[in-house]
């Protein structure tokens, strides 16, 4: 992917299609790489990343990675090609319009990852699939 301060548009002559023949255009994702986070024990968090970038390639999707260890919590937001592993894991939920966090086994830390394919979908990361966006308990994540 390109750096977050670089926006990308792709012309009509660079056509990538999905399995149904629909054109895949480069999508908009939150792209702040790794930031410290206070998102913890919540059903859902907002990324609070202020950088919305256009992914470099039409096939790329939005990804969010939440990690907690003894020292801190971080949230990573990027674009990534689902054909390639990210942090050694396959993006199995890349076609989802929502970023539903799934726990992955990583020694020495708690590791959740999600991917999704609608514009800026990694801005709202969901730890509970029953979570409803109208829930008044929504708490915003504040980066340090």
């Amino acid at each position: 992917t390109i750096p977050p301060h670089v926006q990308k548009s792709v012309n009509n002559d660079m056509i990538v299609t999905d399995n149904n023949g629909a054109v895949k255009f480069p999508q908009l994702c939150k792209f702040c790489d790794v930031r410290f986070s206070t998102c913890d024990n919540q059903k859902s968090c907002m990324s609070n990343c202020s950088i919305t970038s256009i992914c470099e390639k039409p096939q790329e999707v939005c990804v969010a990675v939440w990690r907690k260890n003894d020292e801190n919590i971080t949230l990573e937001t990027v674009c990534h090609d689902p054909k390639l592993p990210y942090h050694d894991f396959i993006l199995e939920d890349a076609a989802s319009p929502k970023c539903i966090m799934k726990e992955k086994k990583k020694p020495g830390e708690t590791f959740f990852m999600c991917s999704c394919s609608s514009d800026e979908c990694n801005d709202n990361i969901i730890f509970s699939e029953e979570y409803n966006t109208s829930n008044p308990d929504l708490l915003l994540v504040i980066f340090q």
Epitope: Q7, P97, K98, C121
Partner: antibody, heavy 116, light 107 residues
Framework: QVQLVESGGGLVEPGGSLRLSCAAS????????MSWVRQAPGKGLEWVGR??????????QFAAPVKGRFTISRDDSKNTLYLQMNSLKTEDTAVYYC???????WGQGTLVTVSS | DIQMTQSPSSLSASVGDRVTITCRAS??????LNWYQQKPGKAPKLLIY???SLQSGVPSRFSGSGSGTDFTLTISSLQPEDFATYYC?????????FGQGTKVEIK
């Protein structure tokens, strides 16, 4: 092939209302932010507003000259974007383009003329 | 809102000429600057994105440079099909704003 086709333009009197439609095809419409951009005759390009995805709440944002008068909505089941224009002024006369927000896909435009 | 100011408003040039159009932002926009070409009766076409990256399918005679507040679009050797109006646009913040346009006419 991405296609964006605007319709609904025409002649309307000042103070009147008009609703523009944009039929989208060839891409996953529900996943995309969409915008309207306008161009007054012989003038430059002016961003009107955008709507984000329904799944993220469908938030809308508008340029100052149209805020409070124009609304943007979408019907993902029909792959259609709408621009509802109320309290129209003569300075709203323009060709209105539907665009895939921040990406290089534009409709052909539809002309709105506000005149008495 | 961020104001975008283009200069000149219009220019006359001949085929083969080197043409330079400038765009100034009222505040820093990093590299969030796009250049569009528009011909009469047509929708705009993206030429340059992110200040200096050439859009796919656009001839290499078009180039862009700059960052922060000052940007330039250069056509190294003007061709007959390049006579059009050119717009800069910032996408750093909402609302994304356009310059007033530069019309490139045949001398």
């Amino acid at each position: 092939q991405v296609q964006l086709v605007e319709s609904g333009g025409g002649l309307v009197e000042p103070g009147g209302s008009l609703r523009l439609s944009c039929a989208a095809s060839g891409f996953k419409f529900s996943n995309a932010w969409m915008s309207w951009v306008r161009q007054a005759p012989g003038k430059g390009l002016e961003w009107v507003g955008r709507i984000k995805t329904t799944i993220s709440g469908g938030a809308t944002q508008f340029a100052a000259p149209v805020k409070g008068r124009f609304t943007i909505s979408r019907d993902d089941s029909k792959n259609t974007l709408y621009l509802q224009m109320n309290s129209l002024k003569t300075e709203d006369t323009a060709v209105y383009y539907c665009t895939l927000d921040l990406r290089d896909y534009w409709g052909q435009g539809t002309l709105v003329t506000v005149s008495s | 809102d961020i104001q975008m100011t283009q200069s000149p408003s219009s220019l006359s040039a001949s085929v083969g000429d080197r043409v330079t159009i400038t765009c100034r932002a009222s505040q820093s926009i990093s590299s969030y600057l796009n250049w569009y070409q528009q011909k009469p009766g047509k929708a705009p076409k993206l030429l340059i994105y992110a200040a200096s990256s050439l859009q796919s399918g656009v001839p290499s005679r078009f180039s862009g440079s700059g960052s922060g507040t000052d940007f330039t679009l250069t056509i190294s050797s003007l061709q007959p099909e390049d006579f059009a109006t050119y717009y800069c646009q910032q996408s750093y913040s909402t609302p994304p704003t356009f310059g007033q346009g530069t019309k490139v006419e045949i001398k």
